[in-house]
């Protein structure tokens, strides 16, 4: 057992029915020595007497607020909750792998640019009784300081009979260099409680892999005199690092046709414009990825040819 | 990815179509070794981060960009002192902290040098013959050093009387080419820097 | 004590449906994921297929995929094989347990597949 | 389809030392725990081992489990003829997760 925060405490159990749980010794925070009485939630039975109380926890029924009184007063709570480990491998009931980048990818974390700003999401399908606390580090050992947010409602997506609801979370490295060569991974850490049941995830990654520019702004069309050949041109996103001369992007121009069957034509460049022949229905669409570290394409920034 | 390779204008930056080739072999090279060595923990997220270069040299620190020297967290460790005399620099332009900069950056390139050749020579060894270090990579690394003309003392190439451990030749290899390729992304993006000041 | 006791093997012609049960007692049945094992006449065991406590979740072996459904009924406390589209390749006792560091077997349920 | 591999077949008279070895890889045996199981002819698997090297209450203490790196091994000391049966070994993979991967199963026989 141990304290997530004041008051609320979390039992480790090898889950597997008639399991025998774990013994818990309950204090009641008080002075007092005599006349104590426990209780479990909103139940009135009395569980037991005196300033402790030894409990067997096996089941959820097992957990939940414990009360001790004395003459009608309430003198301290104490909130079990449980975390189950099945077959060695703790449970991840609460969010949804969601299988990319591979499979048992809880949390996913994305940044527009190096200076040490990230956010994560992570999906679950349950709506109610549901918090979620996160805190970051460079490192594990010796860590450095990141700084999260809360988590927030992101989302929500109805998936066949499911809803589904999307949490996110922004952290910011407090000393971050965006031109450092990083040698700790960033390691992220999310405590889950659903009810009674408590679950933690965790991603481990270098800031470099998780890169994801914003598209590139300001895609612009010049029509070739006497040609079917135009000019794209486009700019850095405004997110993106600074100075771009360091900093720099490659880009990847492609003219689509209305129809997802034709034939796609894709121009890889690492200027901010590209001449192209454009038809008719056609759109032309651009996207950027860091030049010399290839993490994730750009969302598409796109404008129609005619 | 497929990029169609740009080829240098004779007035350009001449150390940055080396620095675009050496990036281009190492990756290549370290995905030949993720591959080959698919049974030995060669991912990033297997491997410990090493820098051979830590406390010896300080490339980061000497090529940071003139805009990011307010950003404190990137002035750590400044102080470094270098020979000053190389063919890469367009001579009048050349500031003393660009002179810096670039022997850091051969002095790493000669470090990771006599590394992959002790490796190679080991890897030679290996009665399975599993992976040995690509000669273009080894070649790229030469050019570089050699356009960017520093004087300094050759590193002997270290011997070891000791059987080789190929196990932790291959894990160490992969340490390297993980750490290297890291390296050559930030020689690349200083080139590419230096280029259009 | 934890028991689960099988039903529904039997002899099947190839392309035919077939479902297995699985009744569980004592214990809370629906506190705990629960797999489908089988093991072909003179072969090692396979795993085929897992379904979590409440049902939400499910996971299939290549072989079975697309083929067999894992299901449950908490309140019936019964777990269910549906097998369909049948080869003589699926011929074998098929084992249901609970999923835990320690854990429970059913008494094994014999399927032939064979026209 | 099995990627934990065992000895087809292992021998001993009563009294003997006899170990099963179960050989795996990094993503299974290297980062998840180990079961053994005994299999006699016409029953269900019965659980020796749980979590590399602990025995269920019940189990007799010449049987014993041990994992190191990618590979894990059960161990009968003296092992008598009740204990010719079949023996398989499971993990899982850290990708597929709940999947069960068994390993080929040792027959384990009992000379004499």
């Known amino acids: 057992i141990w304290e997530l925060k004041k008051d609320v405490y979390v039992v480790e159990l090898d889950w597997y029915p008639d399991a025998p749980g774990e013994m818990v010794v309950l204090t009641c925070d008080t002075p007092e020595e005599d006349g104590i009485t426990w209780t479990l939630d909103q139940s009135s039975e009395v569980l037991g007497s005196g300033k402790t109380l030894t409990i067997q926890v096996k089941e959820f029924g097992d957990a939940g607020q414990y009360t001790c009184h004395k003459g009608g007063e309430v003198l301290s709570h104490s909130l079990l909750l449980l975390h189950k480990k099945e077959d060695g491998i703790w449970s991840t009931d609460i969010l949804k792998d969601q299988k990319e980048p591979k499979n048992k990818t809880f949390l996913r974390c994305e940044a527009k640019n190096y200076s040490g700003r990230f956010t994560c999401w992570w999906l679950t399908t349950i709506s109610t009784d549901l918090t979620f606390s996160v805190k970051s580090s460079r490192g594990s050992s010796d860590p450095q300081g990141v700084t999260c947010g809360a988590a927030t409602l992101s989302a929500e997506r109805v998936r066949g009979d499911n809803k589904e609801y999307e949490y996110s979370v922004e952290c910011q490295e407090d000393s971050a260099c965006p031109a450092a060569e990083e040698s700790l991974p960033i390691e992220v850490m999310v405590d889950a409680v659903h009810k009674l049941k408590y679950e933690n995830y965790t991603s481990s990654f270098f800031i470099r892999d998780i890169i994801k520019p914003d598209p590139p702004k300001n895609l612009q069309l010049k029509p070739l005199k006497n040609s079917r050949q135009v000019e794209v041109s486009w700019e850095y996103p405004d997110t993106w690092s600074t100075p771009h001369s360091y900093f720099s992007l490659t880009f990847c121009v492609q003219v689509q046709g209305k129809s997802k069957r034709e034939k796609k034509d894709r121009v890889f460049t690492d200027k901010t414009s590209a001449t192209v022949i454009c038809r008719k229905n056609a759109s032309i669409s651009v996207r950027a990825q860091d030049r010399y570290y290839s993490s994730s394409w750009s969302e598409w920034a796109s404008v129609p040819c005619s | 990815r497929n990029l169609p390779v740009a080829t240098p204008d004779p007035g350009m930056f001449p150390c940055l179509h080396h620095s675009q080739n050496l990036l281009r072999a190492v990756s290549n090279m370290l995905q030949k070794a993720r591959q080959t060595l698919e049974f030995y923990p060669c991912t990033s997220e297997e491997i410990d981060h090493e820098d051979i270069t830590k406390d010896k040299t300080s490339t980061v620190e000497a090529c940071l960009p003139l805009e990011l020297t307010k950003n404190e967290s990137c002035l750590n460790s400044r102080e470094t002192s270098f020979i000053t005399n190389g063919s890469c620099l367009a001579s009048r332009k050349t500031s003393f902290m660009m002179a810096l900069c670039l022997s850091s950056i051969y002095e790493d390139l000669k470090m990771y040098q006599v590394e992959f050749k002790t490796m190679n020579a080991k890897l030679l060894m290996d009665p399975k013959r599993q992976i040995f270090l690509d000669q273009n990579m080894l070649a790229v690394i030469d050019e570089l050093m050699q356009a960017l003309n520093f004087n300094s003392e050759t590193v002997p190439q270290k011997s070891s009387l000791e059987e080789p451990d190929f196990y932790k030749t291959k894990i160490k290899l992969c340490i390297l080419l993980h750490a290297f390729r890291i390296r050559a992304v930030t020689i690349d993006r200083v080139m590419s820097y230096l280029n259009a000041s | 004590q934890v028991q689960l006791v099988q039903s529904g093997g039997g002899v099947v012609q190839p392309g035919r449906s077939l479902r297995l049960s699985c009744a569980a007692s004592?214990?809370?049945?629906?506190?705990?994921?629960m797999h489908w094992v089988r093991q072909a006449p003179g072969k090692g065991l396979e795993w085929v297929a897992f379904i979590r406590y409440d049902g939400s979740n499910k996971y299939y072996a290549d072989s079975v995929k697309g083929r067999f459904t894992i299901s449950r009924d908490n309140s019936k406390n019964t777990l269910y094989l549906q097998m369909k589209s049948l080869r003589a390749e699926d011929t074998a006792v098929y084992y249901c347990?609970?999923?835990?560091?320690?854990?429970?077997w059913g008494q094994g349920t014999m399927v032939t597949v064979s026209s | 389809s099995y990627v934990l591999t065992q000895p087809p077949s292992v021998s001993g008279t009563p009294g003997q030392r006899v170990t099963i070895s179960c050989s795996g890889g990094r993503s299974n045996i290297g980062s998840n725990t180990v079961k053994w199981y005994q299999q006699l002819p016409g029953t269900a698997p019965k659980l020796l081992i749980y979590?590399?090297?602990q025995r269920p209450s019940g189990v007799p203490d010449r049987f014993s489990g041990s994992k190191s790196g990618t590979s894990a091994s059960l161990a009968i000391t003296g092992v008598q003829a009740e204990d010719e049966a079949d023996y398989y070994c499971q993990s899982y993979d850290r990708g597929t997760h709940p999947a069960l991967l068994f390993g080929t199963g040792t027959k384990v026989t009992v000379l004499g």
């Open positions: 347990k609970t999923h835990g560091s320690h854990d429970n």
């Open positions: 979590f590399n090297d």
């Open positions: 004592g214990f809370t049945f629906s506190s705990y994921g």
